[in-house]
């Protein structure tokens, strides 16, 4: 079960990184049900790259790294909650 959860997490993380690199927003993923609320996911990743510098949003490697780590933590928390909930629900049956 833990392997399955890790598999889901890695797959979800890959999808989100694809979205980030395309300049898309995690919110769309949250809206499709992967998310929950851990602070919302409003994003410094919402705008296309061309617009970001004038908007004061950094695109250097450190900023990207910190954002990626934040996404990973966010998904781990959200999917961890879901997994615990699923186990809890199974126990009630």
């Amino acid at each position: 079960r833990r392997d399955v959860a890790h598999g889901i997490l890695n797959e979800a993380y890959r999808k989100v990184l694809d979205q980030l690199s395309a300049g898309k927003h995690l919110q769309s993923l949250v809206a499709r049900g992967v998310g929950g609320s851990l602070g919302g996911g409003a994003g410094d990743d919402a705008e296309p790259l061309s617009k970001r510098h004038s908007d004061g949003i950094f695109t250097d490697s450190y900023s990207r790294y910190r954002k990626q780590m934040a996404v990973k933590k966010y998904l781990a928390a959200v999917l961890g909650k879901r997994y615990k909930q699923r186990v809890k629900n199974k126990g009630r049956r």
Epitope: G39, G41, D44, F58, Y62, R66, K67
Partner: antibody, heavy 109, light 111 residues
């Protein structure tokens, strides 16, 4: 960026500082907290991502908690000692590119 | 946590001259370039000058420049002006953000 909530407290009293922004949407940026004791240097406390995930300096040891709503970022401080007397700054994004004027926290018995 | 050691204060500079401030980290910063420089004047909050080791922040005069990689970094102020009298801090960003830290600061005095 504007910080508020700083005041004189006695050791052990919990305190919450608030950070708000005008001219930009706070929810679109990671936000960090930094402090500066009187006459001393800057000390990085931690930051919060747009997803609500947090990172803290190793010295924080769970005493401080950063959280956010769509319009505010807060720093909750517990187990305060006189060593925590400082001006607390809130700053925008991971590079701390835009700072508030700071709010003074004085811990004294 | 990382330790960042800066050039001892104060550093004196003549108007029009050049000032160099060094920052040494006890461990390599992320991607060898996750280092920023800030300027702080008395009674004011710090101001970002340089990020990612060598990138000039928005609105910062180009007499400020940053260089270095890994554990050794330098802030250079060319054509020093009276307005540059301030304390300068470096900030290192690391693989583990728990290690993030500022240097102790370097005061620049302009004669």
């Amino acid at each position: 960026v504007e910080e508020s909530g700083g005041r004189l407290v006695t050791p052990g009293t919990p305190l919450t500082l608030t950070c708000t922004a005008s001219g930009f949407s706070l929810s679109r940026y990671a936000m960090g907290w930094v402090r500066q004791a009187p006459g001393k240097g800057l000390e990085w406390i931690g930051d919060i991502s747009t997803y609500g995930t947090t990172d803290y300096a190793s010295w924080v040891n769970g005493r401080f908690t950063i959280s956010r709503t769509s319009t505010t970022v807060t720093l909750k401080m517990t187990s305060l000692t006189t060593e925590d007397t400082a001006t607390y700054f809130c700053a925008r994004d991971y590079w701390l590119s835009l700072w508030g004027q700071g709010t003074l926290v004085t811990v004294s018995s | 946590a990382a330790v960042l050691t800066q050039t001892p204060s104060p550093v004196s500079a003549a108007v029009g001259g050049t000032v160099t401030i060094k920052c040494q980290s006890s461990q390599s910063v992320y991607d060898n370039n996750a280092l920023a420089w800030y300027q702080q004047k008395p009674g004011q909050p710090p101001k970002l000058l340089i990020y990612a080791a060598s990138n000039l922040a928005s609105g910062v005069p180009d007499r400020f420049s940053g260089s270095g990689s890994g554990t050794q970094f330098t802030l250079t102020i060319s054509g020093v002006q009276c307005d540059d009298a301030a304390t300068y801090y470096c900030l290192g960003g690391y693989d583990d953000a728990a290690d993030n830290a500022f240097g102790g600061g370097t005061e620049v005095v302009v004669k």
